[in-house]
């Protein structure tokens, strides 16, 4: 029979072209891509492959070794001169490892029939590949009808005698896929029908989408689907110290490529992304939320000595409101307002000042006015009370001026203008205010209310009274108006610097009406209500000291 090389050599001995071919093949052995998982690679099997040839004089194994003395498993057949060839080569059982679609990569050489003398009628340039699924590792048989044909394999490049002479080896690589597979494993079979072939390597593999970390989500090794157009949706799991709003998913294509990412993971508060992992924020740095990209330095006047901080601690005497974001500097209450001036207009006071030198680092500075009424003699002050009105308001003032109205006249007041901000209520420290002392102008006094009768005689009446409740200044004198009852048009006026008088020249047993008013530098107040007193009869004893209600 014709040998593969077209030259005759001893039986079972590898012809020259095989040696040349194998040397070339060995130099080009490449590692499989990361998305391919080998189920069988004849090049890497160290011992016997355990394949069966049927009939025995068909396919034959050529025993060669590489430079490391590892066996090279090559099968050849070249019965081109004989008719009706039906030579089978069966692999051992191959586990599919859960894959439902597998790939078979064949590396082989094929002799050009035209380059062979004679045998043109019987020489073929193709061979067939079959498979048979089985759960049983010992289920190998050679019932041809049980094997399912995968394809007829033809060479893209066939070689001639001339190629041998030039030492040019034309190694063909053909890949076919099979699926869907439903059993644990399968056998492959190669059928020769009269070609001159050397099967240099058989690699069976499935494709997977290799485990990957994308957007801080770990996607596991995923075996591709059975359908060549199928996309498998795969859920990812967030890496340590990361969280997600939208669970991460990706799609594994039939080619073993990850496509169409959905969702992502984010490093949780206190951690930041570095090299695809979530690293702890170191002391002095913080991250308040997963949605923030990286750890940031503590803002001014704050610190953290912890790892994985989500906020920083305010320094002594500095504060943070609950509503302040953790990225905002810690702040403190403002210093006192400055350069306060007052302007008194009768019973109104206008105050003006300039803002504090130190706002405490905040923009929400406002002012509060505390009003105190002071007794100039005792030096004691008390709250002003509710009768005072503040324009525009007493607290929460944004402008640096305020007007107080409805004050008491001729009264000493102390106004405390306090600067406050958003953290003033958090600070245990002393209030920061500037004081202004003012005295309101004098005004006409209020009416005299409390009048007592003194000695009453037949021709005179003695009266005493108390200063008005609101003198509104220094009482310069009192004016007493009196007349006989029902004789209002004929009245008498007496002036007194004291709070007592005696009206004389009165008729006995007559009723007299008295009204009293006080005067300050601002003028007279209104007269008091009418007080009625009666002189005694001619012969009666005089009365004394009874109070008129």
């Amino acid at each position: 029979p014709a040998s593969l090389a077209g030259c005759y050599s001893a039986p079972r001995r590898a012809p020259l072209w095989t040696c040349l071919l194998l040397c070339a093949a060995l130099r080009t052995l490449l590692a499989s891509p990361s998305n391919e998982v080998n189920l069988l690679d004849s090049r890497t099997v160290m011992g016997d492959l355990g394949w069966i040839a049927f009939p025995k004089n068909g396919w034959e194994e050529i025993g060669e070794v590489d430079e490391n003395y590892a066996p090279i498993h090559t099968y050849q057949v070249c019965k081109v001169m004989e008719q009706n060839q039906n030579n089978w080569l069966l692999t051992s059982w191959i586990s599919n490892e859960g894959a439902s679609r597998i790939f078979i990569e064949l590396k082989f050489t094929l002799r050009d029939c035209n380059s062979l003398p004679g045998g043109l009628g019987t020489c073929k340039e193709t061979f067939n590949m079959y498979y048979f699924e089985s759960d049983d590792q010992n289920g190998r048989n050679i019932k041809e009808n049980q094997y399912i044909k995968i394809d007829t394999i033809a060479a893209d490049e066939s070689f001639t005698e001339l190629d041998l002479g030039d030492r040019v080896m034309k190694l063909n690589t053909e890949v076919r896929d099979v699926g869907p597979l439903s059993k644990k494993g399968f056998y492959l079979a190669f059928q020769d029908v009269g070609a001159c072939i050397a099967l240099v390597s058989v690699r069976v593999y499935y494709k997977k989408c290799p485990s990957v970390v994308r957007h801080l989500a770990v996607f596991p090794d995923t075996i591709t689907g059975a359908d060549s157009s199928q996309l498998l949706e795969v859920s990812g799991s967030c890496v340590n110290h990361s969280v997600t709003d939208e669970p991460p998913k990706m799609h594994c294509s039939a080619e073993g490529e990850w496509l169409v990412p959905i969702g992502k993971c984010m490093c949780k508060a206190g951690y930041e992304e570095k090299n695809g992992t979530c690293q702890v924020c170191r002391p002095g740095f913080f991250k308040a939320s997963p949605h923030i990209q990286s750890c940031g330095k503590c803002p001014p006047h704050s610190y953290t000595h912890e790892e994985a901080s989500t906020s920083c601690v305010c320094e002594k005497d500095y504060f943070r409101r609950e509503s302040d974001p953790p990225t905002m500097a810690c702040t403190r209450p403002p210093s006192a307002p400055r350069n306060a001036i007052s302007n008194v207009n009768e019973t109104s006071v206008f105050l003006e000042w300039i803002p504090p030198a130190d706002t405490g680092g905040r923009k929400d500075v406002s002012y509060y006015i505390a009003c105190k009424k002071c007794n100039s003699h005792a030096g004691v002050c008390e709250e002003c009370g509710g009768h005072v009105r503040y324009l525009p308001r007493q607290s929460g003032l944004k402008n640096t001026s305020v007007m107080m109205v409805d004050l008491l006249a001729h009264t000493n007041y102390t106004f405390e203008i306090e600067a406050v901000n958003g953290v003033s209520d958090l600070s245990p420290g002393a209030r920061q205010y500037v004081s202004v002392n003012v005295t309101t102008n004098q005004a006409a006094p209020s009416p005299v209310t409390n009048v007592k009768k003194g000695k009453i005689a037949k021709n005179s009446i003695s009266l005493s009274w108390q200063e008005p409740d609101r003198p509104n200044g220094i009482i310069l004198e009192y004016e007493i108006k009196y007349f006989e009852k029902d004789q209002e048009t004929s009245y008498t006026i007496i002036k007194s610097k004291e709070t007592t008088i005696t009206a004389e020249g009165l008729k006995p047993a007559s009723v007299y009406v008295f009204q009293i008013r006080a005067r300050t530098a601002a003028g007279y107040g209104v007269f008091s209500r009418r007080f009625e007193f009666e002189t005694t009869p001619v012969f009666a004893a005089s009365s004394d000291q009874s109070q008129i209600p």
Epitope: R282, P283, G284, F285, K297, C298, Y303, H305, E306, E307, A308, V313, E315, K316
Partner: antibody
Framework: EVQLVESGGGLVQPGGSLKLSCAAS????????IHWVRQAPGKGLEWVAS????????YYADSVKGRFTISRDNSKNTLYLQMNSLRAEDTAVYYC?????????????WGQGTLVTVSS | DIVMTQSPDSLAVSLGERATINCKAS??????????MNWYQQKPGKAPKLLIY???NLESGIPDRFSGSGSGTDFTLTISRLEPEDAAVYYC?????????FGQGTKLEIK
């Protein structure tokens, strides 16, 4: 006023144990990292251990790892250093020091130190 | 561990003169644009005192004749006009990574 006061030092035999304390006052103890630093007689400073305010982060020098334990009781404003399997080379003045608040932090307040002598 | 090496081991400088102490780290002590380098002063029988933090920041209450400079692995402490009370041992310390290592110290004497 910030104050750190160490106590618990003394003479101990090799292989023995000792527990140092550091009483803190004048600051919010629970928010501050505190360190132990030691100084052998006539030698330089050697950092020993540190603990964060919430005790979540603890570090030791290789020379004391497995033998010394740093801890704190924030309710008592006190830091501790439990020293076991003491060796002659552990003889030193032990200082506690507060991690500062100005970034990047240094050790801004130190105690007066307590002397530990390991000798037979 | 990061090894801190100070130079010189000791120096004597006249009053009013400038004193310079160097510190070299076996690897960079910088992180995110800041240098984690501190300088301390220690007088006999006393606890160390922080002078400079973050390579160049003067600690509160320290006279401004003290200054620090440098980044990465090379740092310098400078005392611009030496005063009698500046006689002490000076230590550099890195706080970039655990363990926080100190230099061996430099003894400064008044000439």
């Amino acid at each position: 006023e910030v104050q750190l006061v160490e106590s618990g030092g003394g003479l101990v035999q090799p292989g023995g144990s000792l527990k140092l304390s550091c009483a803190a006052s004048g600051f919010t103890f629970s928010t501050f990292g505190i360190h132990w630093v030691r100084q052998a007689p006539g030698k330089g400073l050697e950092w020993v251990a540190s603990i964060s305010g919430a005790s979540t982060t603890i570090y030791y020098a290789d020379s004391v790892k497995g033998r010394f334990t740093i801890s704190r009781d924030n309710s008592k404003n006190t830091l501790y250093l439990q020293m076991n399997s003491l060796r002659a080379e552990d003889t030193a003045v032990y200082y506690c020091a507060r991690y500062g608040t100005s970034f990047p932090y240094g050790l801004d307040y130190w105690g007066q130190g307590t002397l530990v002598t390991v000798s037979s | 561990d990061i090894v801190m090496t100070q130079s010189p081991d000791s120096l004597a400088v006249s009053l009013g003169e400038r004193a310079t102490i160097n510190c070299k780290a076996s690897q960079s002590v910088d992180y995110d644009g800041d240098s984690y380098m501190n300088w301390y002063q220690q007088k006999p029988g006393k606890a160390p005192k922080l002078l400079i933090y973050g390579a160049s920041n003067l600690e509160s209450g320290i006279p401004d004749r003290f200054s620090g400079s440098g980044s990465g692995t090379d740092f310098t402490l400078t005392i611009s006009r030496l005063e009698p009370e500046d006689a002490a041992v000076y230590y550099c310390q890195q706080s970039n990574e655990d363990p926080f290592t100190f230099g061996q110290g430099t003894k400064l004497e008044i000439k």
